[in-house]
């Protein structure tokens, strides 16, 4: 059975309360009165005979919920140059700023906007960007595991596998790819054997970024991520 719509203001029955979401109890009037909707504020509080009078928030001010505020809240200041506005300031919502690409949020506001952006750490050669982020949103670096390498200083590049060569000229290590020797055309005619050479990723590789000053990144230990030990007996 649908609840009866009760017009405000009204005196609540003993043991009953006002509807919390869109009403409030005015102690002075001892009545249940209407709250103001998002985008408005209380211009005049209710009394025993007249309900709450609401008015629209002025420019650069907002209310996001049904309220009994005497004034609207001020929108956060404009986004800084290293931020992008992902939600504009309107009468019903605050402005939300997010960090631009290549930066992470070092200080968040309670409303989820970003107060301070920092440049993402870069992972140097031999280290790739881990799939998970640090709790603060910064990049985590992990040592390239066996058979993989990273030869860039980047906040986006992951460790990728060494190319597989038909003829290996120089083995790869954590910071360099394997070098393949040129293949003799006659080799492809050898019967009863199979071999492969250069890799073709079935997904696109992250683009190499221009190296820049590297901040000390967090190091993530993961499967096989102990530093690779160079051994002269293993071909340099």
């Amino acid at each position: 059975v649908p609840a009866q719509v009760v017009l405000t203001p009204y005196k609540p029955e003993p043991g009953y309360e006002c509807q919390i979401s869109q009403e409030y109890y005015d102690r002075k009037a001892q009545m249940c009165c209407a709250k103001c909707p998002p985008g408005q504020y209380v211009k005049h509080f209710c009394n025993k005979t007249s309900d709450t009078v609401c008015a629209d928030c002025e420019a650069s001010m907002y209310t996001q919920v049904w309220n009994q505020f005497r004034t609207c809240l001020s929108c956060s200041s404009s986004c800084t140059t290293d931020q992008v506005e992902i939600r504009a300031c309107t009468k019903q919502q605050n402005r939300v700023c997010a960090c631009e690409a290549g930066r992470y949020c070092a200080l968040k506001t309670h409303s989820g906007s970003c107060r301070q952006c920092m440049r993402l750490s870069k992972c140097g050669p031999g280290f790739g960007v881990a799939s998970s982020r640090a709790p603060n949103g910064n990049v985590l670096c992990k040592a390239c595991a066996p058979g993989t390498f990273s030869d860039t200083t980047s906040s986006t590049d992951v460790c990728r596998p060494h190319r597989i060569c038909s003829i290996l000229a120089i083995p790869g290590n954590a910071s360099t790819d394997a070098v393949c020797a040129p293949e003799s055309p006659t080799l492809s005619a050898i019967p009863r054997t199979l071999y492969v050479s250069q890799p073709e990723p079935t997904r696109s590789q992250p683009l190499d970024q221009e190296p820049g000053p590297s901040q000390t990144p967090s190091i993530l230990t993961s499967l096989g991520s102990t530093p690779i030990i160079e051994q002269s007996t293993k071909g340099g």
Epitope: A145, P146, G147, T148, R160, P161, H162, I164, C165, S166, I167, L168, P171, G172, N173, A174, A178, L187, I190, T193, L194, Y195, V196, P201, T202, R203, S222, L223, G224, T226, I228, I229, E230, Q231, T233, K234, G235, G236
Partner: antibody
Framework: QSLEESGGGLVKPEGSLTLTCAVS?????????ICWARQAPGKGLEWIAC????????AYYASWAKGRLSISKASSTTVTLQMTSLTAADTATYFC????????????????????WGPGTLVTVSS | IEMTQTPSSVSAAVGGTVTINCQSS??????LAWYQQKPGQPPKLLIY???YLTSGVPSRFSGSRSGTEFTLTISDLECDDAATYYC????????????FGGGTEVVVK
């Protein structure tokens, strides 16, 4: 470049056999590891063991192969697989395969991507 | 490490798409290879490190990883794709009893 297995044939149960993998077109050096795998008739592939083609002699085995099968580098062009106490379950085509090394490979023993295979040699264990 | 490959057999028409799955019992990172084997021949390495195509392999073949689950997809199926496909854990551990999956026979109609 090629790999060629030899030494297969008919052997009696509890007998022994040594298979040889001969490489040509490249040297067995620290740039490569050589591995053995096998395939029973109509069945899937089963990895056996791998050995460093360089001077370290490092080798490692599937847990079921330890003790009964032994991989070794016989020369700069050959790797052998010695098999003892053979049973009918060892009847299979035995393949040798090449794995590309990288700096520090001996510390881990992986990844094993078999990018060059021999044609295989059939071992039949039967009385 | 146990590699569980499904299905054991799959049939599709020329031009169709086939998906083969491989589940590893342990975390092997992206250390997974896919091989194609035709009767009387040794296996041929198609994909390594879960998603990298080896030279000469058509881009109709692709590999992907989600945790310990790996997938080989063959699109625009051709008659020549009829073969048995194996996944292989390329990660060595002391519990590596069998690094290959059981195989999937692909039949092209």
């Amino acid at each position: 470049q090629s790999l060629e297995e030899s030494g297969g044939g008919l052997v009696k149960p509890e007998g022994s056999l040594t298979l040889t993998c001969a490489v040509s077109g490249f040297d067995l050096n620290s740039y490569y590891w050589i591995c053995w795998a096998r395939q029973a008739p109509g069945k899937g592939l089963e990895w056996i063991a791998c050995i460093d083609g360089g001077s370290t002699g490092s080798a490692y085995y599937a847990s079921w192969a330890k003790g009964r099968l032994s991989i070794s580098k016989a020369s700069s062009t050959t790797v052998t697989l010695q098999m003892t106490s053979l049973t009918a379950a060892d009847t299979a085509t035995y393949f040798c395969a090449r794995v590309q090394s990288y700096v520090g490979y001996a510390n881990y023993g992986y990844p094993n991507y078999f990018n060059l295979w021999g044609p295989g040699t059939l071992v039949t264990v039967s009385s | 490490i146990e590699m569980t490959q499904t299905p054991s057999s799959v049939s599709a028409a020329v031009g169709g798409t086939v998906t083969i799955n491989c589940q590893s019992s342990e975390d092997i990172d992206s250390y997974l290879a896919w091989y194609q084997q035709k009767p009387g021949q040794p296996p041929k390495l198609l994909i390594y490190h879960a998603s990298y195509l080896t030279s000469g392999v058509p881009s109709r073949f692709s590999g992907s990883r989600s945790g310990t689950e790996f997938t080989l997809t063959i699109s625009d199926l051709e008659c020549d794709d009829a073969a048995t496909y194996y996944c292989q854990s390329a990660y060595y551990s002391s519990s590596a009893d069998n690094t290959f999956g059981g195989g999937t026979e692909v039949v092209v109609k």
